[in-house]
Each structure stands twice: as C-alpha cells, then as structure tokens.
C-alpha cells in the first residue's frame, strides 16, 4: 500500500491529489491556529523554487514536539526523493533568515496553491 498524507490507498496517489491533500492540510493548520503555532518556533526560510519540498521538510523537521505539523512533515516526505533528517541543510535555505513556523506555513501554502492551479505537481 502507498501511504501518503497518512491515508492508505490501493495504489499510487496521483501527484495532483497528493498536492491537493498537502494544501488542505496546510489550510487546516492555518485555520485551526489559536495559540502561536509550535509555540512560535523559528525555522530557516527557503527559496520557493525547484527542490523546495525537500528544503521545506529540512526546515520543518528541526521543529520537535509540535503535533500540529507532524502530518505536514510526513506528507512533505512523500514529495522528497531522499531521506531527510534533523540538522540537514539544503542550498535552498535562506540561511540568514529565520521566520516563525506560522509564517513559513502561510508562505508555503500560498506557493503550493499556485503550483496546483498551474498544474505543476512535481
């Protein structure tokens, strides 16, 4: 079975479906946010270009003990072709800029929605 986004499915999930599910999860996070997301944890900003799924995961994986983004971390791992572990850094990180997880999620969501609308799924 393929497990993407935490859901078991009878076969590979189409990229457009996987991206839609990731977007819906990010929407869910932003809409259900009451207290500061992940206690206001800061993460490295990333360049929203090719390879950004791995870069996003590399940033978010360094946030521990935040259940609100665990599903997002799992879903992002489905878009990243290599294994990502804490402390790993990509050239796509804007290494001099840290932002709150809430802002990171908002920026990522906006970009992913536009990729979905433009049919760019990989």
């Amino acid at each position: 079975l393929t497990c993407l986004g935490g859901f078991a499915s009878p076969g590979p999930v189409p990229p457009s479906t996987a991206l839609r599910e990731l977007i819906e999860e990010l929407v869910n996070i932003t809409q259900n946010q009451k207290a500061p997301l992940c206690n206001g944890s800061m993460v490295w900003s990333i360049n929203l270009t090719a390879g950004m799924y791995c870069a996003a995961l590399e940033s978010l994986i360094n946030v521990s003990g935040c259940s609100a983004i665990e599903k997002t971390q799992r879903m992002l791992s489905g878009f990243c072709p290599h294994k990502v572990s804490a402390g790993q850094f990509s050239s796509l990180h804007v290494r001099d800029t840290k932002i709150e997880v809430a802002q990171f999620v908002k920026d990522l969501l906006l970009h992913l929605k536009k990729l979905f609308r433009e049919g760019q799924f990989n």
Partner: antibody, heavy 120, light 112 residues
Framework: EVQLVESGGGLVQPGGSLRLSCAAS????????IHWVRQAPGKGLEWIGR????????KYDPKFQGRFTISADNAKNSLYLQMNSLRAEDTAVYYC?????????????WGQGTLVTVSS | DIQMTQSPSSLSASVGDRVTITCRSS???????????LEWYQQKPGKAPKLLIY???NRFSGVPSRFSGSGSGTDFTLTISSLQPEDFATYYC?????????FGGGTKVEIK
C-alpha cells in the same frame, strides 16, 4: 473591502503608447493572480493576460505578446498594463480582475474599467 | 488556442421562460489538476461582468438558484429556470484551464 480601480485610459493616436494602472485595496496582490481583460465597443470579452505578483510569472494571449506588457508594484499594491504600437482595433474598455484567493478558481472582483480610444 | 463557441448569439424571451445557453470548447478543458475551469459571467451595459457559475456547476455566493450550470468535456450549458426582469443581459462562458484563457462570444438575452 476588496476593490480594483483602473485608471490611465484616454485618447491616443495610432502608433502611440499608454500605460494603464489598476490600484488594488482590501487584499494583498501577492496572494492571488491579477488578470487584464478588454472589451471593444459592442463586442465580447477578451482575456489579455495575467500576472502572479508574488514572483512576476506572467502569461499572455499570444496575440498581445510583444505589444502589451503586464507588471506589478507590490509596494504600491498596484498592477499595470503597458500598451505600445496601439491600433484602432485596440479601442476598448480595459478591466483588471482578480482570481479568488482560495483555489484561484474564478474572477471574483473586477474593476470598473477604463476606456482607451485609439484614433487620429 | 481553445475556441469557446456560444449559441445562440442572441435570444428573445419573456419573464418566466426557461432559457438555455450552450458553450462548446474546441478541445477538452479539463485541467491537469482534474478540475474543469468553466465559468459563466453576466454583464449588463456599461458594467463589469459578474460571476454566476464556476467549475461548470457551482453557483457563486449570492447568485439566485434559478441559475444553474452543467456539462463536461467540451459541452456546457447555462440554464435560467425562470427568467426574471433583472436577467436581461449578456452572458459569457469562459475557460480558465488552458492558457491563453478564452471567453465565448456572448449570448444577449433580450425581452420578447
């Protein structure tokens, strides 16, 4: 309140240039796409092109590519349509419109339009 | 480019009539994300267009239930179940699936 207000229309001679503006308020233009649409007198609607102000990704109908240029100024929350080598057939009301902000499925807000008349 | 062909180009009808406008695309307008970005806009003289229907059959907020959309693939329909005086206007279909996006030629609904 979301608003789009076009300006810059007027009378221009054939071969001349004009720059239209679209001032947006009530939302951040970087959060959506902005489109330019025109309508010649008594005719139908024509899509000119659109811009993603977040990254300046611009798409045109090929018939306008080269003569028309879409741009954005995020600091001013404004959009522009630069029109060069104007012809009589470019006479039209020019509208800017935004894609709705959730999934960009449709145009939910339009400006009132600005009339461009190309005539000698 | 995808051509959107509307028919009829104009029609005369009375208040209370059921009105059907069709729109045919020159090729499929199913987007690669699975959505069909087919919209219907209403325009009155001197005014900007207003959205009625999006993604083939979804009524925009505030649009009366007498307006409905249907279709798939390349053939689409806007139906006004019972024409009201404020419905006399020009209607345009629009495809936002493939760039360049394109409008239909319009259908003018006039009073009989």
């Amino acid at each position: 309140e979301v608003q789009l207000v076009e300006s810059g229309g007027g009378l221009v001679q054939p071969g001349g240039s004009l720059r239209l503006s679209c001032a947006a308020s009530g939302f951040n233009i970087k959060d959506t796409y902005i489109h330019w649409v025109r309508q010649a007198p008594g005719k139908g609607l024509e899509w000119i092109g659109r811009i993603d102000p977040a990254n300046d990704n611009i798409k045109y109908d090929p018939k306008f590519q080269g003569r028309f240029t879409i741009s954005a100024d995020n600091a001013k929350n404004s959009l522009y349509l630069q029109m060069n080598s104007l012809r009589a057939e470019d006479t039209a009301v020019y509208y800017c419109a935004r894609s709705e902000e959730n999934w960009y499925d449709f145009f939910d807000y339009w400006g009132q339009g600005t009339l461009v008349t190309v005539s000698s | 480019d995808i051509q959107m062909t509307q028919s009829p180009s104009s029609l005369s009808a009375s208040v209370g009539d059921r009105v059907t406008i069709t729109c045919r695309s020159s090729q499929s307008i199913v987007h690669s994300n699975g959505n069909t970005y087919l919209e219907w806009y209403q325009q009155k003289p001197g005014k900007a267009p207003k959205l009625l229907i999006y993604k083939v059959s979804n009524r925009f907020s505030g649009v009366p239930s007498r307006f409905s959309g249907s279709g798939s693939g390349t053939d689409f329909t806007l139906t006004i179940s019972s024409l009201q005086p404020e419905d006399f206007a020009t209607y345009y279909c629009f495809q936002g699936s493939h760039i360049p996006y394109t409008f239909g030629g319009g259908t003018k609904v006039e009073i009989k």
